[in-house]
């Protein structure tokens, strides 16, 4: 059986594209050798369409290509302008195309709406590519075939059939003839310029029976989109350079003075340090297009885009662009939130997210910012009630309070949550904010176990010590769990003799469980509040064992009890009756709690953690595990 | 919250036929690619079909040890897909499992890796009698 795959059918209409992604085994010659895609004749051969090593046939000349991505062991062929005559049987695969490397694809074409007739008039975009099709009679078949451009009075010679380039075109220019069967030929250009615009005579033959055609070709400077964004909002750039630029360098620059354009991203990894943390280049398709998505917006971010693409990655003559001035509408209604919000490794951070408020009922999601590559924001939590598996037990997305804003809280901190993090909905695309976790030194303030072991049966009491600063602040306990973190009832024992210089405003809080069963495993959280806003939190996780001597368990801060039986495995987990479950002494001497002058008394921003050793976990809400 | 719910699962024959549903439902849950994995006891979960649209495009997905028999599609609102699943053999005994994606990836995933599916149902039992 062959390694390769792909889609075994794919169906479509007239006009459209298709872009067909075939998977191969990623090993070194795999990803170096040639790579093709081929159309299945009725006698068993395969003609081949287009191949990575830069062959195109002429009947895809123009709209299609061949995009090898070696790092993920997969080619991309894009077709565009699809016809009923592109139905058929084909192959895409590795090598020559009589070796069994291959996968059978199934194309089919149905009619679409009807697609224009080939007209005399060009108008085509900057930097793009235009097909000037000449028909041409039989007699005229083996001739000569030229494409003529008028300049003043006398038509120039720009491309022919024995070879002539004209050095204008040099590079960008070819002309196709098509098979016996069909009486065209066509002259392709490609990253047209301004000076391309003119009056163009395509020519069969050379005496008194040669076929002549007329074209005018019309070419736009793209006139700008005029956007205006809220300041600390956000904006999208989707740029739709076509298919023959697919596989050619993308970016997004702003013009500065004169002809300059700085480049703010692009897919070679530049990007300009003003934009860190708040900037994503998403190649939406594999058909050239592609959108840039910038938060946080500022007041100095107003001005003209371009977004093109070259193999520099920067503006050029030729570059396909797309043009947008930005406006940055300073009476924002976007509410102002901090940019950075500061975390004691260990501790926590409760972040406040704004949105719409007039789409109270949309999803709201939480991301993390990466940067490597082109910058992607990978979900974390969402509203919905997922969260994904490695931040459970630390990471809740509550809706509260509610009117415009949501709370994230992320507690267990440590340095490898420090970064960007994104608040956003599945509504209102501009209502996106961005955060920067900073993780400070310190202790955390609330104090509370490393982890504890309680006994089926008995009664288990777990303290939670909170500072004086904290004496005005409601102090609660809860037991996260996949639908939230739900509250639970605690026992105020009095001053809390865990902090020097700490007077009697200090508090015990406990958690007492009586009768301790299975279900009482898991993560507790003790924390504080003010009404609906969220400060620190700190949590313990709580394993059960069988009993093994009468008593209940009182446990001490100096108390860290791991099940006597268990089996610590090298992947950082534990088992205990069978069950695997991260390990929380793995992390006990990182057990953190941000410094609540961020977070209770007024954070207004988006939090996040990348700990792939944590969990993670989400309040008041339904969660799925996948 | 999304929900996957399999149904069609049952006893069938050597040589029959059966097909198999999953409807997705959820507040705003609208899935760009659906597909089917199955789990025989101590097997590794395994890539059936998928079918992922874009615009009025479809590509559709088949498993090695399933082609040519079993065929995948879906309803004109994209939020149920059918398995028809023709001339089963008794190695096709396992537990269907639908999955679904809510949002195109920037990168192409390879339909067949469940890591890559971001939605499970909770499974249909077939058991193909010899």
């Known amino acids: 059986k062959s390694p390769i795959f792909g889609p075994e059918e794919v169906n479509s209409v007239e006009g459209n594209s298709v872009s067909i992604t075939c998977y191969y085994p990623p090993t070194s010659v795999n990803r170096h050798t040639r790579k093709y895609w081929c159309r299945q004749g009725a006698r068993g051969g395969c003609i081949t369409l287009i191949s990575s090593e830069g062959y195109v046939s002429s009947k895809y000349a123009g709209r299609a290509n061949l995009t090898n991505f070696p790092e993920n062991g997969t080619f991309v062929v894009n077709i565009a302008q699809l016809s009923q005559d592109d139905s058929g049987r084909y192959k895409c695969g590795l090598g020559i195309n009589s070796r069994g490397l291959s996968f059978d694809v199934s194309l089919e074409v149905s009619q679409g709406p009807g697609l224009l007739n080939d007209t005399k008039v060009y108008t085509v975009d900057l930097g793009r590519t235009v097909t000037i099709n000449c028909p041409f009679k039989t007699e005229n078949a083996q001739k000569r075939k030229s494409l003529y451009k008028q300049i003043g009075l006398y038509p120039v010679l720009v491309i022919d059939s024995s070879g002539y380039v004209n050095p204008n075109y040099t590079g960008r220019i070819r002309l196709d003839i098509q098979g016996t069967g069909q009486l065209l030929f066509s002259v392709v250009i490609n990253q047209l310029r301004l000076s391309d615009a003119g009056q163009y005579l395509c020519q069969a033959g050379d005496d008194s029976n040669s076929n002549k055609k007329n074209a005018d070709l019309q070419v736009l400077k793209p006139e700008p989109e005029l956007v205006y964004e809220d300041l600390r909002g956000s904006v999208t750039f989707h740029c739709a350079l076509g298919p023959e630029v697919a596989n050619v360098a993308k970016f997004l620059c702003r013009q500065s003075s004169g002809e300059n354009c700085d480049v703010v991203v692009n897919t070679l990894g530049k990007r300009a340090p003003a934009f860190e943390g708040r900037i994503l280049l998403n190649p939406q398709d594999k058909d050239g297009s592609f959108s840039v998505v910038i938060t946080g917006l500022r007041k100095e971010d107003a001005g003209r885009y371009l977004c093109g693409a070259h193999s520099d990655g920067q503006l050029q003559e030729g570059s396909p662009i797309q043009a947008w001035q930005l406006f940055v509408n300073e009476e924002s209604t976007i509410p102002r939130s901090p940019t950075v919000v500061k975390g004691v490794a260990g501790s926590s951070v409760a972040v406040l997210c704004p949105y719409n408020r007039k789409e109270s009922k949309s999803i709201k999601y939480w991301c993390l910012w990466e940067g490597a590559q082109n910058g992607r924001c990978p979900l974390l939590v969402d509203s919905e009630g997922w969260v994904k598996a490695q931040y459970e037990g630390r990471l809740s997305l509550l809706e509260e309070p509610g009117n415009g804003t949501f709370t994230v809280i992320l507690n267990q901190l440590t340095s490898r949550d420090a970064g960007f993090y994104w608040c956003l909905t599945n509504g209102d695309t501009l209502w996106r904010t961005t955060v920067e976790i900073k993780i400070i030194e310190g202790e955390p303030n609330l104090k509370v176990p490393g982890n504890v072991t309680a006994v089926l049966g008995e009664t288990l009491k777990v303290p939670c010590h909170f500072p004086c600063k904290f004496s005005s602040y409601e102090k609660y306990w809860c037991k996260w769990n996949n639908t939230g973190c739900q509250a639970l009832p605690s026992q105020d024992e009095g001053p809390s003799k865990a902090f020097v210089n700490c007077d009697e405003n200090s508090r015990l809080v406990s958690l007492t469980l009586n009768l301790v069963t299975r279900a009482d495993e898991g993560w507790y959280w003790c924390g504080v509040k003010q009404g609906h806003f969220y400060g620190e939190t700190a949590a313990v996780y709580v394993a059960v064992e069988e009993r093994k001597a009468a008593g209940s368990r009182d446990v001490s801060l100096a108390k860290a009890d791991a099940a006597p039986d268990e089996k610590v495995l090298d992947s950082g987990f534990r088992e205990i009756e069978n069950k695997a479950i991260q390990d929380p002494r793995l992390f006990a001497e990182e057990k953190a709690v941000a410094d609540t002058r961020d977070q209770a008394d007024g954070s207004r921003a988006s939090v996040d953690s990348g700990s792939s050793e944590e969990q993670g976990g989400s309040s008041r809400h339904h969660h799925h595990h996948h | 919250e999304v929900q996957l719910v399999e149904s069609g699962g049952g006893l069938v024959q050597t040589g029959g036929s059966l097909r198999l549903s999953c409807a997705a439902s959820?507040?705003?849950?609208?899935?760009?690619?659906m597909g089917w994995f199955r789990q025989a006891p101590g097997k590794e979960r395994e890539f059936v079909a998928a079918?992922?649209?874009?615009?009025?495009?479809?590509?559709?997905y088949v498993g090695d040890s399933v082609q040519g028999r079993f065929t995948i599609s879906r309803d004109a609102a994209g939020n149920t897909v059918y398995l028809q699943m023709n001339s089963v053999k008794p190695e096709d005994t396992a537990v269907y499992y639908c999955?679904?994606?809510?949002?195109?990836?920037?990168?192409?995933?390879?339909?067949?890796?469940?890591?890559?599916?971001?939605?499970w149902g909770k499974g249909t039992l077939v058991t193909v009698s010899s």
């Open positions: 959820g507040r705003t849950f609208s899935p760009y690619a």
């Open positions: 079918i992922r649209w874009s615009g009025a495009t479809t590509y559709k």
């Open positions: 999955a679904a994606d809510r949002v195109p990836k920037d990168i192409s995933i390879d339909p067949r890796n469940p890591k890559d599916w971001d939605y």
